[in-house]
Amino acid sequence: TCEIVTLDRDSSQPRRTIARQTARCACRKGQIAGTTRARPACVDARIIKTKQWCDMLPCLEGEGCDLLINRSGWTCTQPGGRIKTTTVS
């Protein structure tokens, strides 16, 4: 389960209301860090181990997911044809 945490605003600059947001994720046994719907998420460790990246549903709703060659990452293809590529190191 992940929640979005807003870190404290920059109090040294009162006119600025910029706040940093970060995900705080507590994974269950058998889960590790991943990406679901383009956001940080806890996913089945077996997905990461086998590099079946699309099984963690990393793309936004309506986008198509495809594995990169050698399972080095994935691509998310928008309905309009724009492709976003994510590689895993």
């Epitope: 705080r24 507590a26 994974c27 046994k29 058998g30 889960q31 860090a33 940080p40 077996r46």
Partner: antibody
């Protein structure tokens, strides 16, 4: 090099308490789930306890549940095991172990016994009157 | 409980296989020689630490993991424990250990 160095063992009396420590070096301690595993003389390995990388989650084996408390100090890169109401069957060598998975920032991760990639040399505990 | 054979024997140069089943998530294999520290030879099913010889390999099939030592050497004689999570997925568990004898 990854180093895990246990301490705190020795001769203990039944009903007493002890606190084991495991000093870690050579890696980012705060990114790894950690374990305590023990081995009675001439016997096999037994799962004792584990803790998430950030210390928010703990788990215990049935033999020590209710008598043991695992904790960690990520600032000092040290793992602890507090054992109360000691019994003769707690006698054995206690090992500290690291789960290989590197948990990224913002995540709290459990280790996995099958992912243990590093062990300490162990500290011997003898519970006897 | 995990299931692994109590003993396995092989001649030098032969292939030794040790199986472990009954757990979930991932499996590891831990070597222990008399009077020596525990050494991980395989973790996360098939990962091998950099200082472990390539003759050690692990493979997962279903819920059974097999440790294979290809070209067994005399120094491989030891007790081998498998480790994983119990079937409930809530706590760690170890096999009773397999004694590998090199004939």
């Amino acid at each position: 090099a990854v180093t895990l160095d246990e301490s705190g063992g020795g001769l203990q009396t039944p009903g007493g308490a002890l606190r084991l420590s495991c000093s870690a070096s050579g890696f980012d301690f705060s990114s790894h789930g950690m374990f305590w595993v023990r081995q009675a003389p001439g016997k096999g390995l037994e799962y004792v306890s584990e803790i998430t990388n950030d210390g928010s989650g703990t788990n215990y084996g049935s033999a020590v549940k209710g008598r043991a408390t695992i904790s960690r100090d990520n600032g000092q890169s040290t793992l602890y095991l507090q054992m109360n109401s000691l019994r003769a069957e707690d006698t054995g060598t206690y090992f500290c172990a690291r789960s290989s998975y590197v948990c990224p920032g913002g995540f709290s991760c459990w280790g996995d016994t099958g992912q243990i990639d590093a062990w300490g040399h162990g500290t011997e505990v003898i519970v006897s009157s | 409980a995990l299931t692994q054979p109590s003993s396995v024997s092989a001649n030098p140069g032969e292939t030794a296989k040790i199986t472990c089943s009954g757990g979930v998530y991932s499996y590891g294999w831990f070597q222990q020689k008399p009077g020596s520290a525990l050494v991980t030879v395989i973790y996360w099913d098939d990962e091998r630490p950099s200082d472990i010889p390539s003759r050690f390999s692990g493979a997962l099939s279903g819920s059974t993991n097999t440790l294979t030592i290809t070209g067994v050497q005399a120094e491989d004689e030891a007790d081998y424990y498998c480790g994983t999570e119990d079937i409930s997925g809530t706590a760690g568990v170890f096999g009773a250990g397999t004694t590998l004898t090199v004939l």
